[in-house]
């Protein structure tokens, strides 16, 4: 491991579509990938009239957008499906939304996921 970097070996797994996809609904996912490439965790969710609905959580392949992010934070302004990625075991257990506004100050919308 490189000093100062959180290696990701496992992530929280969740799949809202688990029956159709024939997977578990929730659990811990071991992350696989090429030995020299970095691994990350991700979370995706929707905001339906202020109610948070988790879509999927799991492992994410080597992605410079996720480098050195210990927290899972979506920064895009009002996406259809929210996505964040991070480094470190189970770093996707919690996720949040901090839109990067150009003019106004960003507002914080921290989310603690509660799978149904």
């Amino acid at each position: 491991a490189i000093l100062g970097r959180s290696e990701t070996q496992e992530c929280l797994f969740f799949n809202a579509n688990w029956e159709k996809d024939r997977t578990n609904q929730t659990g811990v996912e071991p992350c696989y990938g090429d030995k020299d490439k970095r691994r990350h965790c991700f979370a995706t969710w929707k905001n339906i009239s202020g109610s948070i609905e988790i879509v999927k959580q799991g492992c994410w392949l080597d992605d410079i957008n996720c480098y050195d992010r210990t927290d899972c934070v979506e920064k895009k302004d009002s996406p259809e499906v929210y996505f964040c990625c991070c480094e470190g075991n189970m770093c996707n257990e919690k996720f949040s939304y901090f839109p990067e506004m150009e003019v106004t100050q960003p507002t914080s919308n921290p989310v603690t996921p509660k799978p149904p």
């Epitope: 799991g58 080597d62 992605d63 410079i64 957008n65």
Partner: antibody, heavy 115, light 111 residues
Framework: QVQLVQSGAEVKKPGSSVKVSCKAS????????INWVRQAPGQGLEWMGT????????SYAQKFQGRVTITADTSTSTAYMELSSLRSEDTAVYYC????????WGQGTLVTVSS | QSALTQPRSVSGSPGQSVTISCTGT?????????VNWYQQHPGKAPKLMIY???KRESGVPDRFSGSKSGNTASLTISGLQAEDEADYYC???????????FGGGTKLTVL
């Protein structure tokens, strides 16, 4: 092992659309991006766009904006690239590739646009 | 985003070393370690050789190495072999906040 298998060659008329598929296997489809790249005969590689396979979020090269649509069907682990308003200059081999580093590539799909 | 600039062709004899350059700007090649190198033989799909400027893809011989200085990334192939004759492309990471771009390609001839 990771494999990306693309649909077969297509011959299209100018003005029509083409939809190329890319079926992924050997890894979790929703764990990365799928990128699309094309290569005209005797020319170099040209990036067209990308899709986040789990969120469906897309980004397109400015040149193709408004003419290309990339989608992903997670139930079949398949990505699609649709190019509309075809012209002769769109004759090319179209490739899909996995992830931001393009570490695995499909075999390519030749699209010929001819009247 | 503008295409990256590569020489049209380079050549070398078996056993020699060759270097292929890829020049961008301070906002792409210069600012981040996200340049990749691909090898493409005629009629085949490209193959990732080097990613993140200098990381060798799994299974790629250590004769292939990548580096960067300023706004220029370089691919060096040492101990040239006949099978190294191919087209080589540099390109950038694409996904999320990053848009992809490729160089025009360099034809490597092994004399």
């Amino acid at each position: 092992q990771v494999q990306l298998v693309q649909s077969g060659a297509e011959v299209k008329k100018p003005g029509s659309s083409v939809k190329v598929s890319c079926k992924a296997s050997g890894y979790t489809f929703t764990s990365s991006y799928i990128n699309w790249v094309r290569q005209a005969p005797g020319q170099g590689l040209e990036w067209m766009g990308t899709i986040n396979a789990v969120s469906g979020s897309t980004s397109y090269a400015q040149k193709f904006q408004g003419r290309v649509t990339i989608t992903a069907d997670t139930s079949t682990s398949t990505a699609y690239m649709e190019l509309s308003s075809l012209r002769s200059e769109d004759t090319a081999v179209y490739y899909c590739a996995r992830g931001g580093w393009f570490d695995y590539w499909g075999q390519g799909t030749l699209v010929t646009v001819s009247s | 985003q503008s295409a990256l600039t590569q020489p049209r062709s380079v050549s070398g004899s078996p056993g020699q070393s060759v270097t292929i350059s890829c020049t961008g700007t301070s906002s792409d090649v210069g600012s981040r370690n996200y340049v990749n190198w691909y090898q493409q033989h005629p009629g085949k799909a490209p193959k990732l050789m080097i990613y993140g400027v200098s990381k060798r893809e799994s299974g790629v011989p250590d004769r292939f190495s990548g580096s960067k200085s300023g706004n220029t990334a370089s691919l060096t192939i040492s101990g040239l072999q006949a099978e190294d004759e191919a087209d080589y492309y540099c390109g950038t990471f694409a996904g999320g906040d990053y848009y992809g771009v490729f160089g025009g390609g360099t034809k490597l001839t092994v004399l």
